[in-house]
């Protein structure tokens, strides 16, 4: 399987909410001994590999933000902890999973990574990640709503 990032760049005004999205693609093993672990974290475009370093998102670690479930189940993170920090990560039945960040500030700008681990008990873990950039802007040059740039091209879309 692979992880797709529909948008590689999100440009948002300060105070706006944004939902960063990843999508699981390809064949997904639905055996009873296969489970999935999904999470989000901040990172940097490291020399060795993008997304290798795991930094907190608004003080919440990737452990705090993880989703755990079998292949077909939907899941959400611990509501209380995440929502206290204006965050919510969620996953649906169709391979989409996302993190929503509320009331963006300039400090939220940076590289965000989604991580999917396919756990094949008795065999191995298979991990795949996706990366996307969030730019939070302020002042007269900031957009009125979030503008997202698809990963495949630089055509932008506005999210209201």
């Amino acid at each position: 399987f692979k992880v797709a990032t529909p948008y590689s760049l999100y440009v948002c005004p300060e105070g706006q909410n944004v939902t960063l999205t990843c999508r699981l693609l390809g064949p997904v093993d639905k055996g009873h001994d296969v489970t999935f672990y999904k999470t989000w974290y901040r990172s940097s475009r490291g020399e060795v590999q993008t997304c290798s370093e795991r930094r907190p998102i608004r003080q919440l670690t990737f452990q705090d933000l993880h989703l755990h479930h079998g292949g077909h189940q939907a899941a959400q993170t611990s509501h209380d902890l995440a929502q206290r920090h204006g965050l919510e990560s969620a996953s649906d039945h169709h391979g989409n999973f996302s993190i929503t960040m509320r009331n963006l500030t300039l400090l939220d700008s940076g590289l965000y990574c989604c991580l999917v681990v396919e756990i094949r008990h008795h065999h191995s873990e298979h991990r795949v990640h996706g990366a996307m950039e969030l730019q939070v802007q302020t002042g007269k040059d900031a957009p009125s709503n979030c503008v997202v740039y698809p990963s495949s091209s630089q055509d932008s879309e506005q999210i209201t």
Partner: antibody, heavy 117, light 107 residues
Framework: QVQLQESGPGLVKPSETLSLTCTVS????????WSWIRKPPGKGLEWIGY???????NYNPSLKSRVTISVDTSKSQFSLKLSSVTAADTAVYYC???????????WGQGTMVTVSS | EIVLTQSPATLSLSPGERATLSCRAS??????LAWYQQKPGQAPRLLIY???NRATGIPARFSGSGSGTDFTLTISSLEPEDFAVYYC?????????FGGGTKVEIK
């Protein structure tokens, strides 16, 4: 902050079953792998196996025929049973939290188990 | 199973000196390697994950490097509390395996 605490008898007779319990406090047991590792005197660390929160287990092939790991989520505990023990099973036994695609990040303080008649 | 070989078995150094510990895998583990520190009577403590990332709260004097089969843990300037046994551990597949350990002792 999540903490782990091992408990169980410190002395087990040869051919009997070693039974240890790990109690998880300060966090949920309903995620991650929950592992057992041991360190025999003068030797290195050996991974025994884990139970995933969902109930799936995975054991070291070298011990698989003798090991059972179980979980009781209502008590926030997971347990190790090692049957037909010999002196070679004398070790400090640790329980630990293992996060997928990460590491064994939180460990109990360990409990010494001696196999002797 | 993947065998991890650590060298040297013992490293005798003085505080302030640089420590370089090696871990070699019998087959590639990509960068899925962790380092732990263990002091007498204590549980192991996670230092490095994914070969080169410091775990939370680990001082900057600890650094990891390498990928594939050869890995290094470096302690840039030894503090008195750094004298301990260090283990590497792979997680590219199960069973999880550890190296035999390197003891860093005071010279």
């Amino acid at each position: 902050q999540v903490q782990l605490q091992e408990s169980g008898p410190g002395l087990v007779k040869p051919s009997e079953t070693l039974s240890l319990t790990c109690t998880v406090s300060g966090g949920s047991i309903s995620s991650y792998y929950w592992s057992w590792i041991r360190k025999p005197p003068g030797k290195g660390l050996e991974w025994i196996g884990y139970i995933y929160y969902s109930g799936s287990t995975n054991y070291n092939p070298s011990l698989k025929s003798r090991v059972t790991i179980s979980v009781d989520t209502s008590k926030s505990q997971f347990s190790l049973k090692l049957s037909s023990v010999t002196a070679a099973d004398t070790a400090v036994y640790y329980c630990a939290r293992d996060i997928p695609a990460f590491a064994l990040d939180i460990w109990g303080q360990g409990t010494m188990v001696t196999v002797s008649s | 199973e993947i065998v991890l070989t650590q060298s040297p078995a013992t490293l005798s150094l003085s505080p302030g000196e640089r420590a370089t510990l090696s871990c070699r895998a019998s087959q590639s583990v990509s960068y899925y390697l962790a380092w732990y520190q263990q002091k007498p009577g204590q549980a192991p403590r996670l230092l490095i994950y994914d070969a080169f990332n410091r775990a939370t709260g680990i001082p900057a004097r600890f650094s990891g490097s390498g990928s594939g089969t050869d890995f290094t843990l470096t302690i840039s300037s030894l503090e008195p509390e750094d004298f301990a046994v260090y283990y590497c551990q792979q997680r590219i597949n199960w069973p999880l395996t550890f190296g035999g350990g390197t003891k860093v002792e005071i010279k």
